[in-house]
């Protein structure tokens, strides 16, 4: 993770191995989703800035007994490098603005999609 | 399903302008940037550009820089690629390929296009 | 620009036959390299990405391996419908890049 700062080299850098799995993780939330995700579950929403990752895992292990979301739960715990408990709560969230799970993972993933398009995109 | 549909054929000739479009369904339009290869009669694939329909990023192959452009029309999920200033080696079919990101692989492409230049 | 070398440029084989085609890149592009089949008169199409995950779809006798610099795609057991071009893809950087292609012909 510490490599996102150089995206704006001149050429693309692709993501860790680890950050691709995060990625095709999301991607296939958003593509298989039939049902309201995790039930319609709220979560706070949260600055997709540089802790973004702790942030997203503070917000979504607030969600319990959604097996839908568990992996991607794993892969953010391996992105922080702090443990993270339910309840916790960090400057990164955007706290009087709940939005559904489903738009959560949604925009989580379309940010990791622009930071890896960057410097890539004029 | 996942359907990527081309313009049909084009003669042109030297010195003019051609515009290939590739109207995308079957997913998320802005979901997936949409790269251009393109292919020489007997000829390997040659990577041109691509653009992301989100923001309306490019990124083109310095081959091509200052003779392609590359948009995008959300409204009607069509991408185009226009190539100016033909030569007769731009002869070629042209694909349209998704891909949703850079280094993913190109999993569904467009049935191609030929654009001939001749006088 | 990372240049991708395939070889052989023609391979000869028989059907049931093994195919072994190489891929070979100018610098160490980890796994993002791709491999496409194309036919006569048609678009390309994703046989194998990341080096050796399969495709959903696609035969089991398709299969990809390599990391860095050095890939092979293997075709254990030629159908009659596998002889075609191959072409391997650098999903590495920009620009992205092709290989010239390997034509797996009927011997």
């Known amino acids: 993770l510490t490599c996102l700062g150089g995206f704006a080299s001149p050429g693309p850098v692709p993501p860790s191995t680890a950050l691709r799995e995060l990625i095709e993780e999301l991607v296939n939330i958003t593509q298989n989703q039939k049902a309201p995700l995790c039930n319609g579950s709220m979560v706070w929403s949260i600055n997709l800035t540089a802790g973004m990752y702790c942030a997203a895992l503070e917000s979504l292990i607030n969600v319990s007994g959604c097996s839908a979301i568990e992996k991607t739960q794993r892969m953010l715990s391996g992105f922080c490098p702090h443990k993270v408990s339910a309840g916790q709560f960090s400057s990164l969230h955007v706290r009087d603005t709940k939005i559904e799970v489903a738009q959560f993972v949604k925009d989580l993933l379309l940010h990791l999609k622009k930071l890896f398009r960057e410097g890539q995109f004029n | 399903q996942v359907q990527l549909v081309q313009s049909g054929a084009e003669v042109k000739k030297p010195g003019a302008s051609v515009k290939v479009s590739c109207k995308a369904s079957g997913y998320t339009f802005i979901d997936y940037e949409i790269h251009w290869v393109r292919q020489a009669p007997g000829q390997g694939l040659e990577w041109m550009g691509a653009i992301d329909p989100e923001t309306g990023g490019t990124a083109y192959n310095q081959k091509f820089k200052g003779r392609v452009t590359m948009t995008t029309d959300t409204s009607t999920s069509t991408a185009y690629m226009e190539l100016r200033s033909l030569r007769s080696d731009d002869t070629a079919v042209y694909y349209c390929?998704?891909?949703?990101?850079?280094?993913?692989?190109?999993?569904?492409w467009g049935q191609g296009t030929l654009v001939t230049v001749s006088s | 620009e990372i240049v991708l070398t395939q070889s052989p440029a023609t391979l000869s084989l028989s059907p049931g036959e093994r195919a072994t085609l190489s891929c070979r890149a100018s610098?160490?592009?980890?796994?993002?390299l791709h491999w496409y089949q194309q036919k006569p008169g048609q678009a390309p199409r994703l046989l194998i990405y990341y080096a050796s995950q399969s495709i959903s779809g696609i035969p089991a006798r398709f299969s990809g391996s390599g990391s860095g610099t050095d890939f092979t795609l293997t075709i254990n057991s030629l159908e009659p419908e596998d002889f075609a071009v191959y072409y391997c893809q650098n999903g590495h950087s920009f620009p992205l890049t092709l290989g010239g292609g390997t034509k797996v012909e009927i011997k």
């Open positions: 390929t998704r891909i949703l990101l850079y280094y993913y692989p190109m999993d569904y």
């Open positions: 610098q160490n592009i980890s796994d993002y």
